[in-house]
């Protein structure tokens, strides 16, 4: 099921910035999603549940995000993603077991100065 | 600002079910959003922050949801919203003060058996 997740639209424009969507299987209950920009961790979001099923969300890098039951979207200013960078979603699944780590969708993003053109130069599922 | 929130599309189709979107001001940091179906509380989502700014989300009625910085969307199966029901988003604002309770957008939803037609019979902002 994880292999199917690359077939979604990873980049879109959102309020003058870029939305980067990282999809994951709906069965995943607890996870860590990291967004890499080239080799640097740009965003790091962890969702866990306690024994009372309360959700705890850790966002140590304070990335603007949106979380649903099958995706994490990170919102970047254009400045964060200019000059052409390779973005990669990396997923760690804590629950359900077994523990898994997967590199999900990846893509090369180039934003022209016009801020109107978002070109995927390379698409690596 | 709260009065402007009714002017959004409350209902939309999503994966064969219905997405009900309850918008709130972006300034709100901690809140409870309840979705009423007629007079019954169908969904109840509370977002609070702890001392380390960690987000805690309580969803005691286990509704599928999506949370962003200005909206809570609940996802219902068509069965949940057939036969015509009035849906209402009710917001409690904990932070920033002062504490406020507001009924936001409300609408009457009827889904025909074809599951292709979503008709808003009544729209009460």
């Amino acid at each position: 099921e994880l292999n199917d997740l690359a077939n979604h639209r990873m980049f879109s424009f959102h309020d003058g910035g870029v939305q980067i969507s990282c999809n994951y299987p709906e069965t995943v209950q607890q996870l860590k999603m990291q967004l890499f920009k080239d080799r640097e961790v740009l965003c790091d979001l962890t969702k866990t549940k306690g024994s009372g099923n309360t959700v705890s969300i850790k966002n140590p890098m304070s990335c603007p995000y949106q979380l649903s039951n099958n995706s994490v979207s990170f919102f970047l200013d254009n400045a964060d993603s200019s000059q052409g960078s390779y973005f990669l979603c990396s997923l760690s699944i804590f629950d359900p077991p077994p523990f898994q780590e997967k590199n999900l969708s990846g893509g090369y993003l180039l934003i022209y100065e016009s801020q109107l053109c978002c070109q995927l130069k390379l698409w690596l599922p | 600002e709260l009065n402007d929130l009714a002017n959004h599309r409350m209902f939309s189709f999503h994966d064969g079910g219905v997405q009900i979107s309850c918008n709130y001001p972006e300034t709100v940091q901690q809140l409870k959003m309840q979705l009423f179906k007629d007079r019954e509380v169908l969904c109840d989502l509370t977002k609070t922050k702890g001392s380390g700014n960690t987000v805690s989300i309580k969803n005691p009625m286990s509704c599928p949801y999506q949370l962003s910085n200005n909206s809570v969307s609940f996802f219902l199966d068509n069965a949940d919203s057939s036969q015509g029901s009035y849906f209402l988003c009710s917001l409690s604002i904990f932070d920033p003060p002062p504490f406020q309770e507001k009924n936001l957008s409300g609408g009457y939803l009827l889904i025909y058996e074809s599951q292709l037609c979503c008709q808003l019979k009544l729209w009460l902002p």
Epitope: T48, G52, N53, S56, P96 | G50, G52, T54, S56
Partner: antibody, heavy 117, light 111 residues
Amino acid sequence: EVQLVESGGGLVKPGGSLKLSCAASGFTFSDYWMDWVRQAPGKGLEWVGNIDEDGSIAEYSPFVKGRFTISRDNVKNTLYLQMNSVKSEDTATYYCSRWGRFAFDSWGQGTLVTVSS
Amino acid sequence: DIVMTQSPSSLAVSAGDRVTINCKSSQSLLSGSFNYLTWYQQKTGQAPKLLIFYASTRHTGVPDRFMGSGSGTDFTLTINSFQTEDLGDYYCHHHYNAPPTFGPGTKLELR
């Protein structure tokens, strides 16, 4: 190997206070929610409360809410239970447990707290 | 709060017996495709140990004679071919919501 070692139990008078500790080793302490579970002599298990990975969320059983406080020190890899206004019904063995995402997968040996005048 | 009940409260068993312990919750523990129901074993003088999580998944190292089954509100722990080292108390536990609660326990004693 995961190890949890409780300490601080003993005899305490009704209305008194006691602080229990749980030293954790063998895993990345700051990655896990942690819980306290107690067991009165000859009785079953009862959940006391929990705390999330960085200590910003804590939840409590209705039986101890307002009297007990759970905290943690991720530098010292230690979990704490501060017990105030104790009652005779708080007499129990108190276990520290790691919430392994979907179950209590590791437990300490327990420390006995006796509330008596 | 969700109330967990177990039956029987105690059971006299012999080596080789097939043992069945029942657990019932006051509301469904099914969320999505998961039942938030766990089984623990506690031997005399020891801390509890995890046996089964998500109603039917055996924890690492747990012998395959232990089997969990059930869904919704009714669950069963089965020990196929009971061994004397299986003596002790068995507890079901839910983590569907707060507060998580345990069943009252089932004590297995030698016949």
